[in-house]
Amino acid sequence: EVEKTACPSGKKAPEIDESLIFYKKWELEACVDAALLATQMDRVNAIPFTYEQLDVLKHKLDELYPQGYPESVIQHLGYLFLKMSPEDIRKWNVTSLETLKALLEVNKGHEMSPQVATLIDRFVKGRGQLDKDTLDTLTAFYPGYLCSLSPEELSSVPPSSIWAVRPQDLDTCDPRQLDVLYPKARLAFQNMNGSEYFVKIQSFLGGAPTEDLKALSQQNVSMDLATFMKLRTDAVLPLTVAEVQKLLGPHVEGLKAEERHRPVRDWILRQRQDDLDTLGLGLQG
């Protein structure tokens, strides 16, 4: 805590500018008006303040807004955002996507910090659901964001938001998460034709039941092996050799190389040897 000291004569800051970098911490505390700082927050980022000086500026804003900063200030926090604690952020009411983007930009290239996680949580809760524009923004900054949510949180994602999801956004999702997302994706893409539908649904198929895989096998989709191996084992096991052959198309040839990995291994063991022989791969059941 900086002590309350009077501002030396002629040092009162008429505006936020570069001259303030030469102020000692106590001078900043005494000579910068908090209301002025709040209205000129956009200038702070352009000035190379030290971390200690930023601490003082944060302190001034905290005193001015003990119940939490208004969005007009939050939007222009810039690097000062990195000084905020999750407790500070919980007091905020962020409703603008532009504000969210501005703050995510500050943390860009870094792991999701507790501050960012709290900010996102506050924002999404304020909106009531994870809409398409929000999801678009969040996955652009954090491709793993979707997979960091619990199945319960994912259940609030409307099917319309699924259009914003890219394949890489699902890379770290586990089967429980895909179980929630797959029906939403199926609904979102239901009006697309066969090949276009498969391109979109492919990355969600880790949540698909057997009957949907059987249906896909009738559509000449040529599923690649990496996708096949992400399918639920319990969904793959009931598939016949003919169905797997149709599902994978030319990629069925790769089963030989992956015969020791699940779900390939478990599936092979369920098949009749005569049927496996038709694959032309020398697989042993």
Partner: antibody, heavy 115, light 113 residues
């Protein structure tokens, strides 16, 4: 040892068709798919398609769908590729190669399309 | 289609030198379930057919000398030849077998000074 035998050269006229052969030995013919690859002089390699010798299923690179037809004769352990409506663009070396990893290749057939 | 880009297109080295060549794919070739990269390297000596050197990005085929080392994952791959020998004069191609159509890189021509 594994061998894939291909005739050395084929000379055909434009507009004609040709059937290239690839005789496999030294392994179980129906346990590996057969692939065909095109290489034009001084250029890279292009995958044409593959065939499952066990049931005759074929898959083609879209680019060669109307050009190549793959077949096998299990009794002689031979894979075939028929190329139709030949033009000078089809002049190239054509290789057969075994399996998903293409771990064994034939010596290649040099196809020359010329009048 | 997955585009495979090799560099350099040619290089000349002296016997005993170490050489590295690069292969980049336009999309990831990693099967995260098995942690295998579906990428192979082939060597084609003048007047001969291609020969498999390395598969799954880093597994040497049987009979391939220890001086050949494949590495990389995802979209960036490298073939290194430690202590190049005169018989290594050849074109080297990478190829993805992640999805059809299976595609090859344009090749790197290795010349011996």
């Amino acid at each position: 040892q594994v061998q894939l035998q291909q005739p050395g050269t084929e000379l055909v006229t434009p507009g004609a068709s040709v059937k290239l052969s690839c005789k496999a030995s030294g392994y179980s013919f129906t346990s590996y798919w057969m692939h065909w690859v095109k290489q034009r002089p001084g250029q890279g390699l292009e995958w044409i398609g593959n065939i499952n010798p066990s049931n005759g299923d074929t898959f083609y690179n879209e680019k060669f769908k109307n050009k190549a037809t793959l077949t096998v004769d299990k009794s002689s352990s031979t894979a075939y590729m028929q190329l139709s409506s030949l033009t000078s663009e089809d002049s190239a070396v054509y290789y057969c190669a075994r399996g998903w990893l293409r771990d064994y290749w034939g010596q290649g057939t040099t196809l020359t399309v010329s009048s | 289609d997955i585009v495979m880009t090799q560099s350099p297109s040619s290089l000349a080295v002296s016997v005993g030198q170490k050489v590295t060549m690069s292969c980049k794919s336009s999309q990831s070739l990693l099967n995260s379930s098995s942690q295998k990269n579906y990428l192979a390297w082939y060597q084609q000596k003048p007047g001969q057919s291609p020969k498999l050197l390395v598969y799954f990005a880093s597994t040497k085929d049987s009979g391939v000398p220890d001086r050949f080392i494949g590495s990389g994952s995802g979209t960036d791959f490298t073939l290194t030849i430690n202590s190049v020998q005169a018989e290594d004069l050849a074109d080297y191609f990478c190829q993805q077998h992640y999805t059809t159509p299976y595609t090859f890189g344009g090749g790197t021509k290795l010349e011996i000074k």
